[in-house]
Amino acid sequence: SEVEVVPFQEVWGRSYCRALERLVDVVSEYPSEVEHMFSPSCVSLLRCTGCCGDENLHCVPVETANVTMQLLKIRSGDRPSYVELTFSQHVRCECRPLRE
Amino acid sequence: SEVEVVPFQEVWGRSYCRALERLVDVVSEYPSEVEHMFSPSCVSLLRCTGCCGDENLHCVPVETANVTMQLLKIRSGDRPSYVELTFSQHVRCECRPLRE
């Protein structure tokens, strides 16, 4: 049977270093807020990821931008309330030498 | 200033348990091939990820599907050649109790 095989160039293009959506824990970005809970507890951010086709290179952000999001902060013994939190997103990624 | 703030419902929707593209090392899926190199060394696969809004739940695949990709296999002292490798992708995700 003719199984649909993803051709090499497409596999390469989708695997190569780029900014991809990643779910990041809020408290990992705001460690000082560890005693509070947020809803959602993770947010979707663009992060550089992927392979560079050379083990001496790695995928790094060369341009970032801030994004501000509205989350619910759960304060103990109080009703949840909206807060605004700002996160850094990766806008442009490049393969750069590991020891840079 | 009216800065564009991502509203709560959109933040929630984008963070909630779903199948998201993730770059996965080929050898982590094919550990028996650890002595060979592949190009690309990672592939883009759909994987369940995200928060469930309840710490007793986690995001798990409830439906998977195979995808076959064409990669270059680099054999030591030989020219690279195309191979077909099959990976499991997550198609549908759900929040399920941790102890299930």
Partner: antibody
Amino acid sequence: QVQLQQSGAELVKPGASVKISCKASGYTFTDYYINWVKLAPGQGLEWIGWIYPGSGNTKYNEKFKGKATLTIDTSSSTAYMQLSSLTSEDTAVYFCVRDSPFFDYWGQGTLLTVSS
Amino acid sequence: DIVLTQSPDSLAVSLGERVTMNCKSSQSLLNSGMRKSFLAWYQQKPGQSPKLLIYWASTRESGVPDRFTGSGSGTDFTLTISSVQAEDVAVYYCKQSYHLFTFGSGTKLEIK
């Protein structure tokens, strides 16, 4: 305890502008949204907009864009709403309200009368 | 924009009577992942500022008497006062916070 103290009643002429203040106390001002709500005679409540004192970011009800301008002074924990090009339609009681998505603490209201 | 339709516009009841008022939304206010509806009820007594009674459609605000009960999910919501007291004379508003904020037109409660 949490309090929102609003400025006193205003009688202004059509075409003029007015700035209403709302002084917050009893909590960390920068941690909670301040919303503004209109109650016109014989009408229901209408949300005008919000300001987040932690960032100064604002969001307006489309209906009040160009009419209301929300600002803050974090040093005095005070929120302000300026209303411009006033007409008789702007005659109402205006409330500042803490928090979102649920409005837990309300100011006492400021009566604005627009009349020649 | 989300529109909230309250009914009835007004009602007059005897002391001790049970009363229900409704709020219908033009779209669902339910965040299914959270299993919560973004709807609140407020009470505004004559000459006073509004007061939060119920949030998440059914959670009673601290200090609110238990004769006040909120119910419903999605698009249809109800506020029930199990035994009306003289001090309950007020206008009752529902408010959605799913997308920005809109209030219903209010239900005026009077005593016969």
